[in-house]
Interface confidence: low
Amino acid sequence: SKWVFEHPETLYAWEGACVWIPCTYRALDGDLESFILFHNPEYNKNTSKFDGTRLYESTKDGKVPSEQKRVQFLGDKNKNCTLSIHPVHLNDSGQLGLRMESKTEKWMERIHLNVSERPFPPHIQLPPEIQESQEVTLTCLLNFSCYGYPIQLQWLLEGVPMRQAAVTSTSLTIKSVFTRSELKFSPQWSHHGKIVTCQLQDADGKFLSNDTVQLNVKHPPKKVTTVIQNPMPIREGDTVTLSCNYNSSNPSVTRYEWKPHGAWEEPSLGVLKIQNVGWDNTTIACAACNSWCSWASPVALNVQYAPRDVRVRKIKPLSEIHSGNSVSLQCDFSSSHPKEVQFFWEKNGRLLGKESQLNFDSISPEDAGSYSCWVNNSIGQTASKAWTLEVLYAPRRLRVSMSPGDQVMEGKSATLTCESDANPPVSHYTWFDWNNQSLPYHSQKLRLEPVKVQHSGAYWCQGTNSVGKGRSPLSTLTVYYSPETIGRR
């Protein structure tokens, strides 16, 4: 058969503070008649009584003395055994013995009191893992609460009060005595490694004690940047080295990714080597990865290269070129970096001009030929393929040549050839005699065989192509008599 008591097993306080001991009981019989509070009670077998310092002794009727005393019994005669010690002293540490007597029964209930010289620190409880931007609750727990000694728990981050509203709760129950402050907090990556302090203060804000923890905030790599290590500018064909840098990462970075993907060398972690960099390698981005990957903004390689795809393009006229036309040739290229370029036109190794266009006000057949243009920038120069300029013109420089000569003996053979310069070549010949009578011959050669004296005279030819016609000057053929004819005469 026991008396039933409920109260915290041990209470904690410090010199100058107070203790409030919530306590309930149920006596075995009737009401309480006597109550004595002992400090470190010891049972004396000789006297069958308890010895020890008496902190409080009730009067026989169980009434509480009205005057304020350091130790107060705030209970009653049947169920409440709450106690208050204010102020509490270091030497109050030890056992408190509640000696309860009813009419017929007695009981000694022991409660442990732990009084420290200085205010003991609270204890910060953190979740097992903290991730950035995920709200967590920081808990600061102090195994102390007392009505007569208001305290406050203040949160500091790196020594500066945290502005988030903390919820402070106190428990002064038979189950537990504590003060707890809970702070809902969304940590940022920049809080990683920072010191959070829970500071115990008295009602006036005076520092009493504290507990500190270092925040371990899991976060992806932060402020990731792709850095070009090469001196600028980068030229096509150079070997380019890039590094992937970051400001903070928790856990540590274990790998890196690069885009676009290429058959590139990674000589060390976070370093990329691009050999023989292409002119079209525009941007590169890297990611630093721990449990997460964080991508940097792409960095422009800004590769410089000689002009590309240089070609000659006829821009005027749109159709074929006829002698006398105005002609414009354009030196085109697809791209160049740097953009500033120079042009050079060349025909048969001879420099013709330094503009992007080559212009002929009135083209002549002599301008026909193989043309090239060159485009150069500070990186290099690029030549076009040779481009053939073809000039179409009517037959010109026509002449009649005679074989074997312009004096032929009758009976022999004489061949008249219409020689000309034309583009396209002469497609049709017409022969005329000294009377401007057209002859029934339309090939380039007019063969007279056997030649007669009557054939003597001036001949001319006309050549025709798709562009036009041209005529030769007169050429005279002299046919003389043979010795036989002269002999007959």
Epitope: Q152, P161, T168, Q201
Partner: antibody, heavy 120, light 112 residues
Framework: QVQLQQSGPELVKPGASVKISCKAS????????MNWVKQRPGQGREWIGR????????NYSGKFKGKATLTADKSSSTAYMQLSSLTSVDSAVYFC?????????????WGAGTTVTVSS | DILMTQTPLSLPVSLGDQASISCRSS???????????LEWYLQKPGQSPKLLIY???NRFSGVPDRFSGSGSGTDFTLKISRVEAEDLGVYYC?????????FGGGTKVEIK
């Protein structure tokens, strides 16, 4: 003991700005909010805003945003309030007041007030 | 903004009388942390204000016990059990629970 020493009276022209000060002593300046209050004769009192000198954080009454700018200099334990584009309605006594407790929040110590008169 | 309405505007009293000042807020001034930051200040002519009561009913240190505060939610009262000459001046209620903080219009306690 805790004291707040405010700067002397100011006579300023309309459209001008004025900067008044409040020097704190007797406590850790950076650890208490400093509030500013406006009092016009017969008009009651208005809370302007507050500053936390520890990190310069501020809260303003919407009515005084753009009108008042609160700053603090930890090295000299001095809080400042600058009032801009002054008009006659800005003529008032301005008090600084400390939030005395981070537990109970009350204005336990006040400055003596600075009189600002706006007149051409 | 929370409007703090004080009544009466003027309160003529005889020394030794009980005085009661009412302060009503336009909405609840219970702070999210559960506290009600309602304060009472006394301002005497030519002086800066003095704190009397904080958190509705707590007397500030050095304030005589003839001053008491009560109320909850939106209705609050300051009582002076026996008015003394040094109690004359303008009394202001103040809410520090929600931004912007606001004062009541003031009640002038003067001799009849």
């Amino acid at each position: 003991q805790v004291q707040l020493q405010q700067s002397g009276p100011e006579l300023v022209k309309p459209g001008a700005s004025v900067k008044i000060s409040c020097k704190a002593s007797g406590y850790e300046f950076s650890r208490s909010w400093m509030n500013w209050v406006k009092q016009r004769p017969g008009q009651g009192r208005e809370w302007i805003g507050r500053i936390y000198p520890g990190d310069g954080d501020t809260n303003y009454s919407g009515k005084f945003k753009g009108k008042a700018t609160l700053t603090a200099d930890k090295s000299s334990s001095t809080a400042y309030m600058q009032l801009s584009s002054l008009t006659s309605v800005d003529s008032a006594v301005y008090f600084c007041a400390r939030d005395g407790s981070s537990w109970d929040w009350y204005f336990d110590v006040w400055g003596a007030g600075t009189t600002v008169t706006v007149s051409s | 903004d929370i409007l703090m309405t004080q009544t009466p505007l003027s309160l003529p009293v005889s020394l030794g009388d009980q005085a009661s000042i009412s302060c009503r807020s336009s909405q609840s001034i219970v702070h999210s942390n559960g506290n009600t930051f309602l304060e009472w200040y006394l301002q005497k002519p030519g002086q800066s204000p003095k704190l009397l009561i904080y958190k509705v009913s707590n007397r500030f240190s050095g304030v005589p016990d003839r001053f008491s505060g009560s109320g909850s939610g939106t209705d609050f009262t300051l009582k002076i059990s026996r008015v003394e000459a040094e109690d004359l001046g303008v009394y202001y209620c103040f809410q520090g629970s929600q931004f912007p903080y606001t004062f009541g219009g003031g009640t002038k306690v003067e001799i009849k």
